[in-house]
């Protein structure tokens, strides 16, 4: 069964800056990745970035830099101030659409006990929805 992992890290140098890393553990071909915050995409969450393996990357504030790390993992740097700034308990979700498995989504947030600059290892997060 495919799995999605999500890792959230607060940067030690900038406390309003977060890095989200997501990956897909499956054998299928990824056709689209959607990163959202505040909940799953389409279920109250707001899209931060869309990454297509061949069409490129689109992102919206407070997303600063989204990129492919490998063919099955992505990273997104967020920075904000005021209303658009993420906070420590913000939930971030990554949805991977793949063929033939379908869509798989998982969410994560900053580990409550982590210090800035530290994070939990990128372990698979609970799968919230598989379409």
């Amino acid at each position: 069964t495919p799995e999605v992992w999500v890792q959230v890290r607060m940067e030690a140098t900038e406390l309003s800056s977060f890095t989200i890393r997501c990956g897909f553990l499956g054998s299928g071909s990824i056709s689209l990745v959607t990163v959202s915050w505040g909940g799953p995409n389409g279920a109250g969450g707001t899209t931060l970035a869309v990454l297509h393996p061949e069409r490129g990357i689109r992102q919206w504030a407070p997303a600063r830099q989204a990129r492919w790390e490998t063919q099955s993992s992505i990273s997104l740097i967020l920075e904000g101030s005021g209303a658009s700034s993420p906070c420590a308990n913000t939930t971030f979700c990554c949805k991977f659409a793949s063929f033939p498995e379908g869509s798989w989504e998982a969410c994560g947030s900053l580990p409550p006990s982590s210090d800035p600059g530290l994070s939990a290892p990128p372990t698979p997060a609970p799968i919230l929805r598989a379409d």
């Epitope: 899209t47 297509h52 069409r55 689109r58 990129r67 492919w68 063919q71």
Partner: antibody, heavy 114, light 113 residues
Framework: QVQLQQPGAELVKPGTSVKLSCKAS?????SYWINWVKLAPGQGLEW???????????NYNEKFKNRATLTVDTSASTAYMELSSLASEDSALYYC???????WGQGTTVTVSS | DIVMTQSPSSLSVSAGEKVTMSCKSS????????????LAWYQQKPGQPPKLLIY???TRESGVPDRFTGSGSGTDFTLTISSVQAEDLAVYYC?????????FGGGTKLEIK
């Protein structure tokens, strides 16, 4: 089927503003971002900016950032681009395009003339 | 901004001939993470909006005839029409799909003799 509908033409006076519309149909409006593209006579295509209706957040080409304003009305499934302080060089065909530019409206011809 | 330069600016060929047009970018359009080139080609026929032909430098959009082929990597890209048809009369644009702002080339106008 996915469609983007734009009015055919707008005639405006120099120094004024124009608000162009792009009505979407055939898909969930909030799941697909809208781009705006300029095609001036004898010139190539220029990307003005994009907006994600789900978050109301735009990105702008720096060249247009001070004069273009992108907005959406999700209840009407419509995206708007307002262009201010119009001059003759703004006379052009303005397209909206969905997502990764895979669906285009027919374009609105803006003529700036006194 | 990434500058996209197309050549030639125009060309005139007879139906059935092979056509090649070039697009060069001022920065690499290769994504190092997944080794994909983020370049697209569009066809704009007179009186119509642009139509997506090729994305990812070489992947044909659904419904596009296989006489259209995209190739290249990094900063140098090519669109080839293997056997030009009368309906291919159009302006062809390449586009940086890699990073904001999404710049287009100046276009290559294809005329049929």
């Amino acid at each position: 089927q996915v469609q983007l509908q734009q009015p055919g033409a707008e005639l405006v006076k120099p120094g004024t503003s124009v608000k162009l519309s792009c009505k979407a149909s055939g898909y969930t409006f909030t799941s697909y971002w809208i781009n705006w593209v300029k095609l001036a006579p004898g010139q190539g295509l220029e990307w003005i900016g994009d907006i994600y209706p789900g978050s109301y957040i735009p990105n702008y080409n720096e060249k247009f950032k001070n004069r273009a304003t992108l907005t959406v009305d999700t209840s009407a499934s419509t995206a708007y681009m307002e262009l201010s302080s119009l001059a003759s060089e703004d006379s052009a065909l303005y397209y909206c395009a969905g997502g990764y530019f895979d669906v285009w409206g027919q374009g609105t011809t803006v003529t700036v003339s006194s | 901004d990434i500058v996209m330069t197309q050549s030639p600016s125009s060309l005139s060929v007879s139906a059935g001939e092979k056509v090649t047009m070039s697009c060069k970018s001022s920065q690499s359009l290769l994504s190092s993470g997944n080794q994909k080139n983020y370049l697209a080609w569009y066809q704009q026929k007179p009186g119509q909006p642009p139509k997506l032909l090729i994305y990812g430098a070489s992947t044909r959009e659904s419904g596009v005839p296989d006489r259209f082929t995209g190739s290249g990597s990094g900063t140098d890209f090519t669109l080839t029409i293997s056997s030009v048809q009368a309906e291919d009369l159009a302006v062809y644009y390449c586009q940086n799909d890699h990073s904001y702002p999404y710049t287009f080339g100046g276009g290559t106008k294809l005329e049929i003799k």
